[in-house]
Interface confidence: medium
């Protein structure tokens, strides 16, 4: 099974070769290269020197080889870089090339969503409800769930809205939002609203959005 690697959008991924080099072979007698699953070459170190004529344009200038750890660093990661990579090492002998090592890696590229933000899109009406939008941007992969938590003095209610999502054609990052019309269960108490975004690995919470409700005036004393 390929080695699973996770790295973040616009950052750097380390694609290891995990070559033990038990024979203590010099780079000057080896050919080391990485290819993706479309057979496009990311990097080639030919007998100790980096060779660029075989490198595909989408990887040009985005890689660096660490000869100490036999690791290729892929910089400025894009979502489209996710997938399978293979490191292959050949030993160049007078009789030809002998493959002595190979390793597959499976790269996942992540992007952290921004902290969810609650924006009211209407004032509290006489019907005692408020329209809210909660949004979070620039994340990957798409989240599992987005919800709103309504907390009063003596109850907590969770609203699951329909998550709207859009994906940027270039970066492939997602923006997500939900819109809710929240009716207040207890008119006499103040309340705090939170928005929650759940991904496979994290749970992001918005800053609290507080609604202060004025206490209604008590009825006048009844005089017989």
């Amino acid at each position: 099974a390929p080695l699973k690697i996770q790295a973040y959008f616009n950052e750097t991924a380390d694609l290891p070769c995990q070559f033990a080099n038990s024979q203590n072979q010099s780079l000057s007698e080896l050919v080391v290269f990485w290819q993706d699953q479309e057979n496009l070459v990311l990097n080639e170190v030919y007998l100790g020197k980096e060779k660029f004529d075989s490198v595909h344009s989408k990887y040009m200038g985005r890689t660096s080889f660490d000869s100490d750890s036999w690791t290729l660093r892929l910089h400025n990661l894009q979502i489209k870089d996710k997938g399978l990579y293979q490191c292959i090492i050949h030993h160049k002998k007078p009789t030809g090339m002998i493959r002595i090592h190979q390793m597959n890696s499976e790269l996942s590229v992540l992007a952290n969503f921004s902290q969810p933000e609650i924006v009211p899109i209407s004032n509290i009406t006489e019907n005692v409800y408020i329209n809210l939008t909660c949004s979070s941007i620039h994340g990957y992969p798409e989240p599992k769930k987005m919800s709103v938590l309504l907390r009063t003095k003596n109850s907590t209610i969770e609203y699951d809205g329909v998550m709207q999502k859009s994906q940027d054609n270039v970066t492939e990052l997602y923006d997500v939002s939900i819109s809710l019309s929240v009716s207040f269960p207890d008119v006499t108490s103040n309340m705090t609203i939170f928005c929650i975004l759940e991904t496979d690995k994290t749970r992001l919470l918005s800053s609290p959005f507080s609604i202060e409700l004025e206490d209604p005036q008590p009825p006048p004393d009844h005089i017989p």
């Epitope: 050919v31 290269f33 290819q35 699953q37 479309e38 057979n39 070459v41 080639e44 075989s54 489209k80 996710k82 997938g83 399978l84 293979q86 292959i88 050949h90 090339m97 493959r99 597959n104 499976e106 996942s108």
Partner: antibody, heavy 116, light 112 residues
């Protein structure tokens, strides 16, 4: 573990179409391509085409252009192949296979019989 | 299109014997950039799906017994079974992935 589960056998009439499915599990579905292969008694194994799921592009064997259409539903990790205007020549077992640089896992096959 | 020719189309051997089968390509399968031969060998037992044995012409898939060996480069490739076992009864196919995909016609191995 990696599995490709194909839909069950199909008995169809000449001129009709059939759509067979291949559901992947146990791996990141979008990281691999899905190949489709035909096996008939007359022609052993024939490559139909490949769909690269992540990039959403397809390549067909010239012979199967217009006959086969490959699609994918990423949300259910399922690849589909539709065969159109069926004739007795299309009676065969159809396999899907996972592929990166080679086809390392295969489905169990879907038998398609074309008969009036 | 790349054409793969397999020979023989069938052969029968006794358990313990050595077997070689050939796959010839109409053009070189050696990728000059990656220096790999884009040829794989598959085994298909009766009533089963094909199973990957060898890829890059000579790399054994994990779990495949070491009696199976792939060799060759360019246009001529060979699959060798050093000591045939009863469970090796199958059809063996070569396939190229140098330019899309093509299968050879297969070699049927029978056990005497």
């Amino acid at each position: 573990q990696v599995q490709l589960q194909q839909s069950g056998p199909e008995l169809v009439r000449p001129g009709e179409s059939v759509k067979i499915s291949c559901k992947g599990s146990g791996y990141t579905f979008t990281d691999y391509a899905i190949q489709w292969v035909k096996q008939s008694h007359a022609k052993s194994l024939e490559w139909i085409g490949v769909i690269n799921i992540y990039y959403d592009n397809t390549n067909y064997n010239q012979k199967f252009k217009g006959k086969a259409t490959m699609t994918v539903d990423k949300s259910s990790s399922t690849a589909y192949m539709e065969l159109a205007r069926l004739t007795s020549e299309d009676s065969a077992i159809y396999y899907c296979a996972r592929a990166a640089w080679y086809m390392d896992y295969w489905g169990q096959g879907t038998s398609v019989t074309v008969s009036s | 299109d790349i054409v793969l020719s397999q020979s023989p189309s069938s052969l029968a051997v006794s358990a313990g014997e050595k077997v070689t089968m050939s796959c010839k390509s109409s053009q070189s399968l050696l990728n000059s950039r990656t220096r790999e031969n884009y040829l794989a060998w598959y085994q298909q037992k009766p009533g089963q799906s094909p199973k990957l044995l060898i890829y890059w012409a000579s790399t054994r898939e994990s779990g495949v017994p070491d009696r199976f060996t792939g060799s060759g480069s360019g246009t001529d490739f060979t699959l060798t079974i050093s000591s045939v076992q009863a469970e090796d009864l199958a059809v063996y196919y070569c396939t190229q992935s140098y330019n899309l995909y093509t299968f050879g016609g297969g070699t049927k191995l029978e056990i005497k």
